[in-house]
């Protein structure tokens, strides 16, 4: 069938998931589109162990994850329950800060330089991480 049993080239396998780490930036929605076109999703962090794995690979760089509150409540892109799930916000975050002067608040979550989470303006061009679970139809390895 079309199910994948190993990760594509340039993806990293960890705990039955495949992860892809960008090295340049896009706005949150465009990062989300990239992952979806690869039959993946922006990374959903469900445990401290997964947090440390991702943090190790991205280093001290602002990086989008699959968590947003653009429609009101905070939601993970794959439907994982936010309220009962793992969280790793920086102190006093999320704050939906309006003082940046870019219009609106802050609706998209990212890893900060120390790995803890912050909400920020979704249009900022940050790096991102895609995730897809093994044993399901998946994405093409880079061909270019």
């Amino acid at each position: 069938g079309s199910e994948r049993t190993c990760c594509p080239v340039n993806w990293v396998e960890h705990e039955r998931s495949c992860y892809w780490f960008s090295r340049s930036g896009k706005a949150w929605a465009d990062a989300d589109n990239y992952c979806r076109l690869e039959d993946a999703h922006l990374v959903v962090v469900t445990s401290w162990e997964e947090q440390k794995f991702v943090q190790h690979h991205i280093g001290p760089v602002n990086t989008w994850m699959g968590l947003h509150d653009q429609n009101g409540p905070w939601k993970w892109v794959d439907g994982t329950d936010y309220e009962t799930g793992f969280k790793n916000w920086r102190p006093e975050q999320p704050d939906d800060w309006y003082g940046h002067g870019l219009g609106g608040g802050e609706d998209c979550a990212h890893f900060t330089d120390d790995g803890r989470w912050n909400d920020d303006v979704c249009q900022r061009p940050y790096r991102w991480v895609c995730e897809t679970e093994l044993d399901k139809a998946s994405q093409e390895p880079p061909l270019l």
Partner: antibody, heavy 122, light 107 residues
Framework: EVQLLESGGGLVQPGGSLRLSCAAS????????MSWVRQAPGKGLEWVSA????????FYADSVKGRFTISRDNSKNTLYLQMNSLRAEDTAVYYC???????????????WGRGTLVTVSS | EIVLTQSPATLSLSPGERATLSCRAS??????LAWYQQKPGQAPRLLIY???KRATGIPARFSGSGSGTDFTLTISSLEPEDFAVYYC?????????FGGGTKVEIK
């Protein structure tokens, strides 16, 4: 041989429907994101729609959203574009194109078909 | 959406000359930019991706440069088969968009 071959174009009246097909060969179609790009006579290129390898995610240009539907049958190595409520401004050569993925996080059209002409006229 | 403006619209040159084509984005696209060549009656062909990387099988006379909003495609010495229309395309923001094209014609 690595190739894409479109079919299904033709003359259709405004408000009518047409279904384009694109037969792929020579590469692993089932894991490849695919797209449709069109070119009106004497004009430039316009992206129309895209679909992920497994078909789970689809994307559309605003100009065709709600009227066109992209789909694929990986068992047949075939990409489709169902076009409804056609307008005169949809007249164009429609190209099927494979989206190559780069390590930087870009998607570019690295393989194109020869195109099929769709003419919308009464 | 991001608007890509190509200039000049037409470039009249002789074989052996250097061609310099410009593509300017309405906002930064980082390095998410590609160049395509299209000859009459044919489909486009990918030349350059990620602003400066040559696609498979593309001769070394084609080179791309730039980042942010200003990009350049250079053909170091025009061969007869290089006379065609050239398009730039960005994949920084949805939707994917193309420039209006530059026609390189024989002088």
């Amino acid at each position: 041989e690595v190739q894409l071959l479109e079919s299904g174009g033709g003359l259709v009246q405004p408000g009518g429907s047409l279904r384009l097909s694109c037969a792929a060969s020579g590469f692993t179609f089932s894991t490849s994101p695919m797209s449709w790009v069109r070119q009106a006579p004497g004009k430039g290129l316009e992206w129309v729609s895209a679909i992920s390898g497994a078909g789970a995610s689809t994307f559309y240009a605003d100009s065709v959203k709600g009227r066109f539907t992209i789909s694929r049958d990986n068992s047949k190595n075939t990409l489709y574009l169902q076009m409804n409520s056609l307008r005169a401004e949809d007249t164009a050569v429609y190209y099927c194109a494979k989206l190559g993925t780069t390590v930087s996080g870009g998607h570019y059209f690295d393989l194109w078909g020869r195109g099929t002409l769709v003419t919308v006229s009464s | 959406e991001i608007v890509l403006t190509q200039s000049p619209a037409t470039l009249s040159l002789s074989p052996g000359e250097r061609a310099t084509l410009s593509c300017r984005a309405s906002q930064s696209v980082s390095s998410y930019l590609a160049w395509y060549q299209q000859k009459p009656g044919q489909a486009p062909r990918l030349l350059i991706y990620d602003a400066s990387k040559r696609a498979t099988g593309i001769p070394a006379r084609f080179s791309g440069s730039g980042s942010g909003t200003d990009f350049t495609l250079t053909i170091s010495s025009l061969e007869p088969e290089d006379f065609a229309v050239y398009y730039c395309q960005q994949d920084s923001n949805h939707p994917l968009t193309f420039g209006g094209g530059t026609k390189v014609e024989i002088k």
